[in-house]
């Protein structure tokens, strides 16, 4: 497949509500407008698929209803949000972009965004 450059931030800290957002930007060398974006999680040398969506450039991303991801697109940028994260979900989240159609097919894989998730401290019992 033809290589395509994908850029994403090195580090992101999830919010106290377990939400992390980052931008995945790809340098589209072809004319393809049917694009597939996949978020992969790498931890302990294991790679698992977190979520994926195919969209037409200019459209919003539509993830499956039960997906923990949401996203918007603008030109060659995809703004990804991952929800429901807990401390155990800390890891390297890799953005993979494929230009699916029309040909030629292009594949780009980012270096990954290290997402740190800190579980909030439980609220102490109140005497009031």
């Amino acid at each position: 497949c033809k290589a395509m450059h994908v850029a994403q931030p090195a580090v992101v800290l999830a919010s106290s509500r377990g939400i992390a957002s980052f931008v995945c930007e790809y340098a589209s060398p072809g004319k393809a407008t049917e694009v597939r974006v996949t978020v992969l999680r790498q931890a302990d040398s294991q790679v698992t698929e977190v979520c994926a969506a195919t969209y037409m450039m200019g459209n919003e991303l539509t993830f499956l209803d039960d997906s923990i991801c949401t996203g918007t697109s603008s030109g060659n940028q995809v703004n990804l949000t991952i929800q429901g994260l807990r401390a155990m979900d800390t890891g390297l989240y890799i953005c993979k972009v494929e230009l699916m159609y029309p040909p030629p097919y292009y594949l780009g894989i980012g270096n990954g965004t290290q997402i740190y998730v800190i579980d909030p401290e439980p609220c102490p019992d109140s005497d009031f």
Epitope: N59, M100, Y105
Partner: antibody, heavy 120, light 111 residues
């Protein structure tokens, strides 16, 4: 569940034209190109062309330029194909198809086909 | 356009045996390490069903007895062990470039 529901069979006279439809459901219609294929009886498949449902941009196999016209109606998630100046050579089953999530899977989901018979 | 030549045109095999269908492309369908060759199964009165994509990857819900191999210009579809339900037409298809093209088809029957 992705579904492509095509219109029913057509019996048309030589020289006439026909318009068939392909109603999409189970996915966002504007996120995938719609492709059209022709399969003559007992033969292989020929790619007619594709349309981008987002903006209506089309691209045709040179062989079908001037024969086929592809359109979409975003409001009803329906793609259509118009065939003109029909001859017996145009008698065939016509399919609409959508791509999948694997690389190069341009025809992962298919309509059931529309049979067009050209006869006087 | 890339021309795909399938062989044999028809094939009969015993249940439980291996059936092999070949597809030769007029030029390479490889691009940077990926072979853009797909295989379809078609039964009478039905649309084609995607069996194998990118030469060797199984389509969704496709039984493990279907496998694909090859690169460049020469590809094959293997079915083992053959089952009654495998009686059908089989087509190869390249998706390296537009226009996508299909092979002439192979009719597979049970002996």
């Amino acid at each position: 569940e992705v579904q492509l529901q095509q219109s029913g069979p057509e019996l048309v006279k030589p020289g006439a034209s026909v318009k068939m439809s392909c109603k999409a459901s189970g996915y966002t219609f504007t996120d995938y190109y719609m492709k059209w294929m022709k399969q003559s009886h007992g033969k292989s498949l020929e790619w007619i062309g594709h349309i981008n449902p987002n903006n209506g941009d089309t691209f045709y196999n040179q062989k079908f330029t001037g024969k086929a016209t592809l359109t979409v109606d975003k409001s009803s998630s329906t793609a259509s194909m118009h065939l003109n100046s029909l001859t017996s050579e145009d008698s065939a089953v016509y399919y609409c198809a959508r791509g999948g999530d694997g690389r190069g899977t341009w025809f992962a989901y298919w309509g059931q086909g529309t049979l067009v018979t050209v006869s006087s | 356009d890339i021309v795909l030549t399938q062989s044999p045109a028809s094939l009969a095999e015993f249940l439980g045996q291996r059936a092999t269908i070949s597809c030769r492309a007029s030029e390479s369908v490889d691009s940077y390490g990926i072979s853009f060759m797909n295989w379809f199964q078609q039964k009478p009165g039905q649309p084609p069903k995607l069996l194998i994509y990118a030469a060797s990857n199984q389509g969704s819900g496709v039984p493990a007895r279907f496998s694909g191999s090859g690169s460049g210009t020469d590809f094959s579809l293997n079915i083992h062990p053959m089952e009654e339900d495998d009686t059908a037409m089989y087509f190869c298809q390249q998706s390296k470039e537009v226009p996508p093209t299909f092979g002439g088809g192979t009719k597979l029957e049970i002996k």
